[in-house]
Amino acid sequence: EVEKTACPSGKKAREIDESLIFYKKWELEACVDAALLATQMDRVNAIPFTYEQLDVLKHKLDELYPQGYPESVIQHLGYLFLKMSPEDIRKWNVTSLETLKALLEVNKGHEMSPQVATLIDRFVKGRGQLDKDTLDTLTAFYPGYLCSLSPEELSSVPPSSIWAVRPQDLDTCDPRQLDVLYPKARLAFQNMNGSEYFVKIQSFLGGAPTEDLKALSQQNVSMDLATFMKLRTDAVLPLTVAEVQKLLGPHVEGLKAEERHRPVRDWILRQRQDDLDTLGLGLQGGIPNGYLVLDLSMQEALS
């Protein structure tokens, strides 16, 4: 808290300019009018104010706007945004995408801070859904943003926004998140032809059900092993050897290197050894010839 002292003669600030960097903290407090600061916020970022000086400027704005800053001030906070607490930000009503971009730019190159997370949360809640332009902006600044949302939050993403998603945006998503995103992606890309569709849907396939994988296997898609390894185990298990062979195309040879890892390991255990042998990869662990396979899960469902 800065003590209230009178402004020395001739030091009253008539505008926010670079001469203020030579003001001591108490001089800034005494000589800079909060209303002047609010109307000239766009100048603050152009001036190398120190950490301590920014504290004083924030204090002045807090006194002027105890209920929260107006968007006209928020948009021009610049480095002063780094001084804001999540509690400060919860008082704001940010509706403009330009304001969001301006504040994300301040934090660019750094991990998402609690301030940024709160800002994004306020913005998205204010809009009611994660529209394409917002998603475009957020994933440009934070590629992992989408995967930081809960499945419940992801459910508010409209299918049209999926066009903004890049493969790297889904790198850290878990199966529960992909379960929500996959149907949206399927809907978004439904009018594309086979090969183009596969390129777009590929990153989302970790949420695909068995029937969709079976359908893809009929389209000569040549899925790579990295994508196959991210598929849901429960979706892969019912696939036949022939279907997996068609799905992977020339990449089928990669199964050998992955035979001890899920979902390949679990899938092998479900296949007849005879069928596995037709691949000529030396995959071992299938059901020996002459054994009967009982699908207990089906039996449980019926009882």
């Epitope: 670079e18 152009a46 190398p48 950490y51 480095y79 780094l82 750094h110």
Partner: nanobody, 114 residues
Framework: VQLVESGGGLVQPGGSLRLSCAAS????????VAWYRQAPGEQREPVAA???????IYADSVKGRFTISRDNAKNTVYLQMNSLKPEDTAVYYC??????????WGQGTSVTVS
Amino acid sequence: VQLVESGGGLVQPGGSLRLSCAASGSMFSINAVAWYRQAPGEQREPVAAMTSGGSTIYADSVKGRFTISRDNAKNTVYLQMNSLKPEDTAVYYCNGGWLLAMDYWGQGTSVTVS
């Protein structure tokens, strides 16, 4: 992001030195920057500043003797110090943008006028 100041040393009164400050990333090309100094037992004070628009300003004590400049291509800020006086003896620091706002500082470079 790191700040590395250099160019300090021992110089006689009336002499000159050119200080350099390099930053990793493209920090200086987009931000307002400043040189500060801290004499023994004193608080750190601004000496010269350049706004993001390129206008410069100097402390009264160094006006006409010091010049701040920057080379965006090299991401470096300079302080040309002429007609040095014993009272210019201090550790000199540069800073700007995000680092300044978050109170991160480099090691500084020591200038002794004697």
